[in-house]
């Protein structure tokens, strides 16, 4: 009879065990365990009748189609085998054990005691069949196994082979290389690869297989396993396989599909191809005169671009438009997108006008083309070029006039300072005790007229100032302070200020230049109580033209000592010139006993200590600060007076051979102007040079050469 066993383990014994088994008996045990397991069988006791080749009694172990072992007897001999310590393993999940005894037993035989168990199959070690083994990685577990793939691969639906996702490859460059996945390593199995070459219309794709070509094939059937097919429009080329690469293919199309198919077996290295776009050829190009074409090639095809540029000093001219370069392109119909332009010499055109300057052409016919040369010069003697620039400009390749130092910037013509058109006489008489100034003697002298219409009644006064540049006047702060009913320092409105330059006789202003004020700047620390920091600036609405009667004075170097004692300076003004009229009379009566013609006087600088002492001895709050110096004579007789305020006290600088403004008429008193031991007090300009330049918005270096050259 047959016994079916389905457990994972169990015991099998001969009939009647442990007693002797009966004669003429046959029992079959069919053991079935789940897939992924095999059956292990071993005997703990075995005692059967011996016979040649186990003809009488035996235990036979078999599978569906194979006898695994036949056992009998008690011990193994040449012709019979007992299991002993041997273990019988089924190759699969089924094992059949048959026990048979013949009709007679000479002795009592106790039979057998066997045990079985299901044991795991390690499929990863034991699968040798390529059709069944994992493509990349195998993972065993009790009762089964599974496969996995290397990075970049996907497990096929057969759960065994590893394929790649390669159906979405787009190539748009004009040249490129396409290979089978993992080339030159074997390509993946079970894969469908699609490569699309999509170029701009007008190009044609040429294909060439290179290096190794190794695709699984078959000796009789054309490419049944793995293959390449090339699809051009409706036409399909291929399939291709084997070890011989196809010849180069000219597709005559801008769009190509490459299909690569691999089945689930085989180890082949794959393929590599390069593709190249071909286009229509364009005619040969000739570079323009004075120009070149880049890149320079023997042949040009569709989509090739060339850049036309010109030699240094020439510009590309296309349709009357100048440019640095011009690009043309080979079109799909084999023509160029444009004609070759011409190269035209660069023209810097007419040079910019120089304020207070002239231009002379160094090149014949007043040429303004590349490498032409011009020279700027300033209107001498009233202006000179800043930093002694050469003024030479060359027409550059960029089409701009260039100077070696200034680049494309124009030079600056700075007003010459401190050089009157007439030389001042050495003999100077007595503004009290002064004399008439000849026109052009003090070309920096400015008359400042203030008419304050915001006051009731309207207030009108005047003072002097000194021209520093074409746009700026230096004067005393108290001249431009609103004549208020308190001691607050508020500047007069610029609308109330008029400046006269080149004026000689106040009765005849026709020859003078009159200008409105754009800005009135008082020194921020001007103190009405003691006239400390009595300095101010007026910016003119428009720059004034310089000439023999209108020229600036030079600013001094920054030196706290100021002018040396006993140095002689000149000061001019239209102030009170009559020594017999008192200041109080003028203030109270409103009479203007002023000079019509500009007066000037020569005065020595008084030692600071002497001046301080002279004022400290007086009643009233008179302080001579370090921002002031005094000038005049102990015996009096010569002095500046009311109305001369803000005028320049100038000293001739031997080093620069120029007149420098060292002082500004500030104050004096309380006795009358020109009184004995009443020195005129002047603002020490050298203490304010930085402040002046800052207000004028110019760096100090601009002026240094004027005074120190």
């Amino acid at each position: 009879h047959t016994v079916e066993l389905n457990n994972m383990f169990g015991q099998i014994q001969s009939p009647g065990y442990p007693d002797s088994y009966p004669s003429d008996s046959e029992v079959t045990w069919n053991i079935t365990v789940p897939d992924g397991f095999r059956i292990k069988l071993y005997f703990m006791h075995f005692n059967l009748e011996s016979s040649y080749l186990c003809e009488y009694d035996y235990v036979k172990v078999e599978t569906e189609d194979q006898v695994l072992a036949t056992f009998c007897g008690r011990e193994t001999t040449d012709t019979e085998q007992t299991p002993g310590q041997e273990v019988v393993l089924s190759p699969g999940s089924f094992m059949s054990i048959t026990f048979r005894s013949d009709f007679s037993n000479e002795e009592r035989f106790t039979g057998f005691d066997a045990h079985y168990m299901a044991v795991d199959v390690d499929e990863c070690k034991e699968r040798e069949d390529e059709e069944l083994s994992c493509d990349h990685y195998c993972h065993n577990y009790i009762g089964g196994y599974y496969c996995s793939c290397r990075f970049g691969y996907i497990l096929h639906t057969d759960n065994r082979t590893c394929r790649v996702e390669c159906s979405d490859n787009l190539f748009t460059q004009r040249t490129g290389v396409i290979t089978s996945p993992d080339f030159p390593n074997p390509y993946p199995k079970s894969s469908e690869c699609l490569y699309t070459i999509e170029l701009e219309e007008g190009f044609m794709v040429n294909l060439q297989f290179e290096d190794i070509f190794d695709i699984e094939d078959h000796p009789e059937v054309p490419c049944p396993y793995d293959y390449i097919k090339i699809k051009v429009g409706p036409k399909v080329l291929g399939p291709f396989c084997g070890e011989k690469a196809p010849e180069p293919i000219s597709t005559q199309s801008h769009s190509v599909l490459i299909l690569f198919h691999s089945d689930n077996s085989g180890e082949n290295r794959g393929w590599r191809l390069s593709y190249r776009a071909a286009g229509n050829e364009c005619p040969e190009l000739q570079p323009p005169v004075h120009g070149k074409i880049e890149p320079s090639q023997a042949k040009y095809f569709f989509k090739d671009q060339v850049l036309v540029s010109c030699d240094t000093g020439y510009k590309v001219l296309k349709d009357n438009v100048e440019m640095d370069t011009f690009q043309i392109e080979c079109l799909k119909d084999g023509t160029w997108s444009n004609k070759i332009p011409t190269c035209k010499i660069v023209d810097c055109r007419a040079p910019g006008e120089l304020e207070h300057g002239l231009i002379t052409f160094s090149t014949r016919n007043n040429l303004t083309t590349y490498k032409s040369e011009i020279k700027y010069s300033c209107q001498e003697p009233y202006y000179k070029m800043l930093n002694n620039n050469t003024g030479i400009y060359t027409c550059s390749a960029q089409g701009v006039w260039m100077n070696k130092v200034l680049g494309r910037s124009l030079p600056t013509c700075l007003p010459e300072c401190g050089q009157p058109s007439r030389s001042l006489p050495s003999l100077v008489k007595r503004i009290i005790g002064g004399r008439n100034a000849e026109p052009g003697l003090f070309p920096w002298q400015a008359l400042i007229v203030v008419e304050d219409t915001s006051r009731v009644p309207n207030d009108k006064w005047f003072g002097s100032g000194a021209l520093l540049s074409a746009s700026w006047i230096l004067t005393a702060a108290h001249v431009l302070r609103s004549q208020r009913r308190d001691t607050t320092v508020i500047p007069v409105s610029k609308e109330h200020v008029t400046v006269y330059l080149g004026l000689h006789d106040v009765r005849d202003k026709s020859g003078a230049v009159n200008s409105s004020a754009a800005r009135v700047v008082l020194h921020p620390d001007f103190n009405i109580q003691n006239y400390n920091h009595d300095i101010a600036l007026v910016q003119l609405q428009e720059p004034v033209p310089l000439g023999p009667h209108v020229m600036p004075v030079c600013l001094p170097r920054l030196e706290p000592e100021g002018p040396a004692p006993h140095m002689l300076g000149l000061v001019a003004g239209w102030g009170i010139s009559n020594p017999n009229v008192t200041v109080d009379e003028i203030i109270s009566s409103g009479t203007r006993t002023l000079s019509d013609v500009l007066q000037y006087v020569k005065l020595p600088v008084v030692p600071h200590a002497e001046c301080k002492t002279s004022y400290e001895s007086r009643s009233g709050n008179y302080s001579v600060t370090e921002n002031m110096f005094c000038a005049g004579y102990y015996e009096g007789g010569k002095d500046t007076c009311l109305g001369d305020s803000g005028g320049a006290f100038v000293i001739f600088d031997d080093l620069s051979q120029r007149w420098v403004v060292q002082g500004l008429v500030s104050w004096g008193g309380p006795e009358e102007c020109g009184s004995k031991q009443v020195y005129g007090v002047y603002t020490k300009v050298s203490n304010y040079v930085d402040w002046v330049w800052e207000q004028m918005g110019l760096p100090q270096s601009v002026v240094e050469p004027q005074v120190e050259r």
């Epitope: 108290h478 508020i490 309380p670």
Partner: antibody, heavy 114, light 112 residues
Framework: QVQLVQSGAEVKKPGASVKVSCKAS????????INWVRQAPGQGLEWIGW????????KYNDKFKDRATLTVDTSSNTAYMELSSLRSEDTAVYYC???????WGQGTLVTVSS | DIVMTQSPDSLAVSLGERATINCKSS????????????LAWYQQKPGQPPKLLIY???TRESGVPDRFSGSGSGTDFTLTISSLQAEDVAVYYC????????FGQGTKVEIK
Amino acid sequence: QVQLVQSGAEVKKPGASVKVSCKASGYTFTTDDINWVRQAPGQGLEWIGWIYPRDDRTKYNDKFKDRATLTVDTSSNTAYMELSSLRSEDTAVYYCSSLEDTYWGQGTLVTVSS
Amino acid sequence: DIVMTQSPDSLAVSLGERATINCKSSQSLLQSRTRKNYLAWYQQKPGQPPKLLIYWASTRESGVPDRFSGSGSGTDFTLTISSLQAEDVAVYYCKQSYNLYTFGQGTKVEIK
């Protein structure tokens, strides 16, 4: 013609602040200063401070410099005087004046009472 | 700080008579550079803002009757109404503008 028009009367509690305005017209606001003066009932004139609209310079009577703030808004030609930490003795008529006291506002009565 | 002291505190004058008010400063108001005395005189009538009469000690403001005159220099100043009119009844203040501003305590002028 020149006019200075001040804001209306105010009643404030001790410790509070008051801000009086003074709107100028008829002249260029930035060319002259604005002065503030006050007068307690039955008392004399007391100068508070001064502001110059062109550059916002200010000057104060030492007595008020910690409590008074003078400002201007040149876009509306208006000057302001703010007095903080009010006490009963700040009850007064507050005047603004311009063009060096040639023109005065009508005065603003500020009453400080609990 | 400059202190301004007016005298008398009040003054009763007959119509057409001269009225004189004095003002003394604690320091000189004469500015040596500008040669001006920074002193002003104001008139204030009840319920009205003050009115400027005199500045720089002696300069009459535009539109002020010439019966009003100012004098003095340094520290001592005087306002004179040469012939008192009914409309001149008011409180008169002096003010220094030499260093910031300070008012005198005021002088009340009445008709006798």
